[in-house]
Amino acid sequence: MNGRVDYLVTEEEINLTRGPSGLGFNIVGGTDQQYVSNDSGIYVSRIKENGAAALDGRLQEGDKILSVNGQDLKNLLHQDAVDLFRNAGYAVSLRVQHRLQVQNGPIGHRGEGDPSG
């Protein structure tokens, strides 16, 4: 029997210093470009090799970015989100949501604390 796939969601504050070639990542999402169904959030789609984000090591492809320098990214058009990053200055604080896939045991073998239903 196959195991059930669940997700462990954690949040982290990541402080990046803009490098010579910028922050070094790509984003998808926005109210006009939903990447996840019914979610207009902003997601990291590419970490560029040797860029600031890659060298820092904490930001991951697939992370959802919740805020930039304290400014919420909810309900933004895609280009407005891009512009926010581009104008964020030298020191950039990102609040991000990591979504880690975890494989549970076979279905029917519920562990302690595993919600039923």
């Epitope: 910028g22 790509n26 998808v28 990447y35 789609s45 590419r46 581009r86």
Partner: nanobody, 128 residues
Framework: QVQLVESGGGLVQAGGSLRLSCAAS????????MGWFRQRPGKERDVVAT????????YYLDSVKGRFTISRDNAKNTVFLQMNSLKPEDTAVYYC??????????????????????WGQGTQVTVS
């Protein structure tokens, strides 16, 4: 990292057709820009065709325009290269490539148009 496996290459006569496939795994396919490149004997690797993550923007090498078509099937995590009216000069190893799509948060001029992060092993196409 994205794992890419190409298939569909082979030997074909001039004027014939082939359809290359590239199956991707390792991360969500729907956020990936995909490309087909080729390396002809004794030459450098060249871009043949690309398709962006949303599927609404494609690029073709001038010499294949009107003959080759790139497409993607997000449900099957696969990108295709339909090659028609093949010519002997299309003989090459064809490589599939992937990168995260979307917009760079850096300068809009930070294009790196044909800069891809992950590569397949290649499939040989020979046109006689």
């Amino acid at each position: 990292q994205v794992q890419l496996v190409e298939s569909g290459g082979g030997l074909v006569q001039a004027g014939g057709s082939l359809r290359l496939s590239c199956a991707a795994s390792g991360r969500p396919f729907s956020s990936l820009d995909m490309g087909w490149f080729r390396q002809r004997p004794g030459k450098e690797r060249d871009v043949v065709a690309t398709i962006n993550w949303t599927g609404d923007s494609t690029y073709y090498l001038d010499s294949v325009k009107g003959r080759f078509t790139i497409s993607r099937d997000n449900a099957k995590n696969t990108v295709f290269l339909q090659m028609n009216s093949l010519k002997p000069e299309d003989t090459a190893v064809y490589y599939c490539a992937a990168r995260g799509g979307g917009s760079s948060v850096d300068s809009e001029y930070d294009v790196g148009e044909f800069e891809y992060d992950d590569w397949g092993q290649g499939t040989q196409v020979t046109v006689s």
